[in-house]
Interface confidence: low
Amino acid sequence: APSCPQNVNISGGTFTLSHGWAPGSLLTYSCPQGLYPSPASRLCKSSGQWQTPGATRSLSKAVCKPVRCPAPVSFENGIYTPRLGSYPVGGNVSFECEDGFILRGSPVRQCRPNGMWDGETAVCDNGAGHCPNPGISLGAVRTGFRFGHGDKVRYRCSSNLVLTGSSERECQGNGVWSGTEPICRQPYSYDFPEDVAPALGTSFSHMLGATNPTQKTKESLGRKIQIQRSGHLNLYLLLDCSQSVSENDFLIFKESASLMVDRIFSFEINVSVAIITFASEPKVLMSVLNDNSRDMTEVISSLENANYKDHENGTGTNTYAALNSVYLMMNNQMRLLGMETMAWQEIRHAIILLTDGKSNMGGSPKTAVDHIREILNINQKRNDYLDIYAIGVGKLDVDWRELNELGSKKDGERHAFILQDTKALHQVFEHMLDVSKLTDTICGVGNMSANASDQERTPWHVTIKPKSQETCRGALISDQWVLTAAHCFRDGNDHSLWRVNVGDPKSQWGKEFLIEKAVISPGFDVFAKKNQGILEFYGDDIALLKLAQKVKMSTHARPICLPCTMEANLALRRPQGSTCRDHENELLNKQSVPAHFVALNGSKLNINLKMGVEWTSCAEVVSQEKTMFPNLTDVREVVTDQFLCSGTQEDESPCKGESGGAVFLERRFRFFQVGLVSWGLYNPCLGSADKNSRKRAPRSKVPPPRDFHINLFRMQPWLRQHLGDVLNFLPL
């Protein structure tokens, strides 16, 4: 057979050959970082001639071209500099907002050597819509300028850029855009492992958090997992074994999959793993219908037995058939368990596709995905029951559009990635799940089902009983620490008689814990400003209690997420380099932020936290309170910027015994504490013997109700000082 000519050098780069100079061999070019090969590859045809995939004209000289990042096409409500057609590696673009708009995202972004911008999309927002302004990523054009409930925006990419993410997004009732942020990227761009690992890990962690991570006993020998009937995860690993994957690369696919299996089994969840290798046809090495799929050693052993030569007779890439075999597996399991049963409906499914190219036979893989979505009844309510991760490896023949089509689209998450090579893939799987930080004490998970008890809905909520009858509330922020208000403890510091009542699944009364240590903010002094005619002052109204024993995590007892921590960062599904300020911008992102606190009877009540201009008018009312503040000249003497303000319009007001409880909000089905109940101008429980009855203030009341909550974003130094070795804090 003829061999292909050897005059294929690339100026400034190198090349590799999959099968020497023989027909069928794939020549892959590579360039130093910051440059990309054009063309990326050539194929040796049976005629002994090189063919460049997708090329229309004859063989052109291969060159290394400089990588460039796409320019903004439009930037609303602000300006960007410098204005270039595209940007070189290392080049910066800066964003500024017009007056009245606040910048969300990165004010300066740098073009990275993979043709991707660092940081996050800059958006100039005024918080006016039901959903935040979704922004326009660099290189994209957006149509649709209304951000109300039900409004849609559409995106397309300029010139030859490829869109990944959602081309259409809808503003949902919960104030969050459907789908995932669209990104326009160069066809030759790829992802760095250090970006993919946290993105993949964050998404996966969220899924694992949703899969009911209950504590299970492990046998002392081996790692046999005791399966319980709570949540269950089916993980399907699809490994490309087509001709263009070298044997060495296939080994790394296997190793990476083994790492994934090892990590997933160390989460306290029930999991079954399927292993499928594919080329022209799929080969099922382990099915979720096999009991062994729940045993880590069996799964890893079936992976190790996966043989590169299994597919030597059919060397195409039939991604459709591989995904269809997952569909058939699901179909069989559904028939086995019964379509209507909880056992079937409560299984979450995650598919990880590892491929080095685009499918070239067997029809569109999208069809198989549609079948899978159909059988799992994936809709807005059940969106969390399926995650498809499409990971392309090796830049040469990977089709961004196809990967993007296959990957799931979820707000704040990415499911489609292209990595430069299998080594990068290995790094990703090694770092994506840092299990030690996530198991068991995963934060901010509340049961949102209609039949859940109040304590299951807010499992962080605790009651504090000091010596006097009057109680306070607090929130678990770890398995041994409670955050509450300092004013609860103003009658002396002997806490030997205090008790903290924590939720317990075995008792509707909860479980009582003694306190090992109380840390009360030294800055708190209710009489600090008495000389100024301010009879009570609640600055620094914050305290921490260390319980005498660790709380056993359960459906009734689990910490809430504290912003500015790595734990909260995972729950928010934010990138790894996020800061405390990013969390504040994301959580307190409107002039009126819907939030909650827990009432004496355990129910969740609604408030609106006022920000910006609205905070000023919310706080202003204090000047009308002549009893507590007889000769107040400056409201800020009482309401410092340590406080969040609520109590306007239809807000509920906290009662006296609810002090210290968490003021929290929900994002992405997780809960985050942004404040704690401190003081207010009206007590709705006053004169009421029944803890279930609250009296609304008469509309004519002067002053009208207002409630003030310690803002945890303003207490960071103190929190870090005392919780530095309990929680992992992000940079400010």
Epitope: P32, Q33, G34, P66, P88, V89, G90, G91, N92, Q110, P113, K423, H426, Q427, E430
Partner: antibody
Framework: QVQLVQSGAEVKKPGASVKVSCKAS????????MYWVRQAPGQGLEWMGI????????TYAQKFQDRVTMTRDASTTTVYMELSSLRSEDTAVYYC????????????WGQGTLVTVSS | SYELTQPPSVSLSPGQTASITCSGD??????TCWYQQKPGQSPVLVIY???KRPSGIPERFSGSNSGNTATLTISGTQAMDEADYYC?????????FGGGTKLTVLG
């Protein structure tokens, strides 16, 4: 072609500072990172730090954190490395090298600048 | 801090294959580069990303990396290959060099 031309040899007294320059030419200055590596007589290579020519951001090796300052002048495509509080063990050849942060290595090196610290 | 260990010296006759090793904890999970330095000259990059050759470096230079060990192999060693060889990797944001190996081509 790519060239990194360093300033000439220096003799310094202990406690003094030295500033070595490295002029880059033949490529897009802001596309590549610049590194500084030193080599004491008869010894191995020791990495000192990195500077991003586009933005000027730096990362220094722990050992030199308090004594080294790397700067760049984009208009003259020159990077500088200043080492303060010199001691005799700082006697070495100091190299600037071009490359990427990560796996691509330092693909072009300056000719080296010998700094001798002696009282 | 992360350390890379190399043998101080390797000797062999012309035409033979030289193998220079570089070991470090889980080094196979990191990328390794190799540099050649001849007396009185600046170092030259001979291998990057474990096994890739920059243009201008002869095909007889190859690299591999797995487990805890990276290896630089020079097949058909020539007198002109006599030099010091350094391995280098990254540990978080810090570049780490091995202590260097002196390759002597006898005769």
């Amino acid at each position: 072609q790519v060239q990194l031309v360093q300033s000439g040899a220096e003799v310094k007294k202990p406690g003094a500072s030295v500033k070595v320059s490295c002029k880059a030419s033949g490529y897009s200055f802001t596309t590549y990172y610049m590194y500084w590596v030193r080599q004491a007589p008869g010894q191995g290579l020791e990495w000192m730090g990195i500077i991003t020519p586009s933005g000027g951001s730096t990362t220094y090796a722990q050992k030199f954190q308090d004594r080294v300052t790397m700067t760049r002048d984009a208009s003259t495509t020159t990077v500088y490395m200043e080492l303060s509080s010199l001691r005799s063990e700082d006697t070495a050849v100091y190299y600037c090298a071009r490359g990427y942060e990560g796996s691509y290595g330092f693909d072009h090196w300056g000719q080296g600048t010998l700094v001798t610290v002696s009282s | 801090s992360y350390e890379l260990t190399q043998p101080p010296s390797v000797s062999l006759s012309p035409g033979q294959t030289a193998s220079i090793t570089c070991s470090g904890d889980k080094l196979g999970n990191k990328y390794t580069c190799w540099y050649q330095q001849k007396p009185g000259q600046s170092p030259v990059l001979v291998i990057y990303q474990d096994n890739k050759r920059p243009s201008g470096i002869p095909e007889r230079f190859s690299g591999s990396n797995s487990g805890n060990t990276a290896t630089l192999t020079i097949s058909g060693t020539q007198a002109m290959d006599e030099a010091d060889y350094y391995c280098q990797t990254w540990d978080s944001s810090t570049a780490v060099f091995g202590g260097g190996t002196k390759l002597t081509v006898l005769g």
